[in-house]
Amino acid sequence: VPRWRQQWSGPGTTKRFPETVLARCVKYTEIHPEMRHVDCQSVWDAFKGAFISKHPCNITEEDYQPLMKLGTQTVPCNKILLWSRIKDLAHQFTQVQRDMFTLEDTLLGYLADDLTWCGEFNTSKINYQSCPDWRKDCSNNPVSVFWKTVSRRFAEAACDVVHVMLNGSRSKIFDKNSTFGSVEVHNLQPEKVQTLEAWVIHGGREDSRDLCQDPTIKELESIISKRNIQFSCKNIYRPDKFLQCVKNPEDSSCTSEI
């Protein structure tokens, strides 16, 4: 008789999850000389230890501490790019502007990007059928707790001017329920961070509105200024041109507003 298995509302663990994590770790440490000392088998063991045999609605930040320790990485604190609901463009940007870093440009962020995982209480099995959904099932699930933990640490490390890329096509350009809005904003350290600069990315070609005046951006400014951090905002009207100008800043068309 097959054993009854908990059915969750979210998709199950990404197929070939252990192999993917291990392969990504090896690839990352090969590309980044400063992380060559990392033992990828130990990283996988620590990752696995955070959620295997544990109830997938009862995961804590402490569960991930061994992994956090192994994945400790120093990125230039004044070169941090946060993003919300516009991951692809943020990643395209840091691929061109190599001295800036999103969370997914760090080892731990790179390992977990776009993956889902969970285990089952009291068994060493990985659940490939379903995993808890943040809204429908529980917030303390392995994936959500992982991203909350690494996002908090990433924000805490930031200094000087921190940039955040926001999606101007969404109804809530700044969403306080996003990881950026609920975790990163509140963990920027006023003693170290002087300014948060928001880049609001426009979607439509003919969209000439000043989205920095959007009520949700005003809300972000309020939250940030109350933390004693300065706030600035720029409209990126032409994201395609923006990226092109990052690649070729000498281009004559790059002096005009983008």
Partner: antibody, heavy 125, light 111 residues
Framework: SLEESGGDLVKPGASLTLTCTAS?????????MCWVRQAPGKGLEWIGC????????IYYASWAKGRFTISKTSSTTVTLQMSSLTAADTATYFC???????????????????WGPGTLVTVFS | AYDMTQTPASVEVAVGGTVSIKCQAS??????LSWYQQKPGQPPKLLIY????LAASGVSSRFKGSGSGTEYTLTISGVECADAATYYC????????????FGGGTEVVVK
Amino acid sequence: SLEESGGDLVKPGASLTLTCTASGFDFTTYYYMCWVRQAPGKGLEWIGCIYTGSSDSIYYASWAKGRFTISKTSSTTVTLQMSSLTAADTATYFCARDRPSGNDDYIYDGGMDLWGPGTLVTVFS
Amino acid sequence: AYDMTQTPASVEVAVGGTVSIKCQASQTINSWLSWYQQKPGQPPKLLIYQASKLAASGVSSRFKGSGSGTEYTLTISGVECADAATYYCQQGYSFGNVDNAFGGGTEVVVK
């Protein structure tokens, strides 16, 4: 509405915890919940605020850091823990909600629109 | 630090008259300033937020807020006996590095 409780007569050096209980709304909509005090015959003095959307965002007046602790203890209660009390802490302590303004609960300073009646703390030797 | 200086500390005004209360911030506060009215034995009542917006339908249009940057003013016109109270300004711009978000208060005495 808001209601403060826990005010008392205490000796110098004592600790005390005040509780603010919300009725008719809860903290699933994000607010800044603030504590303000008023010594007899004096003006309003801001103690600090907690952003109910994130336990990481708690703010204190520079003079209150270390001796005062604000916490969200449930979806309808916020507490103010006070330690090493002195006669200068004798005051009525108010809890206030710094409201959202604009549509869809955007928080960009709507002012403290809801206040409790206050609870009296007297420190005497 | 964000310090709020309120003047005058006390003012006397005749019924029907006009009174102005000033509030100066030590740094720009982006018009995130509120005004409150407090009567003895009561908690404060919000009158104006974001420097110039009336807080609720119950607040008389005789109360007018103005200003920007670091200088703000509350003007009460057509003063009534019921306006006798202490008025406070409060900045909502920064909660970091603040001694007191409130001004010192202005007592309005109505003759």
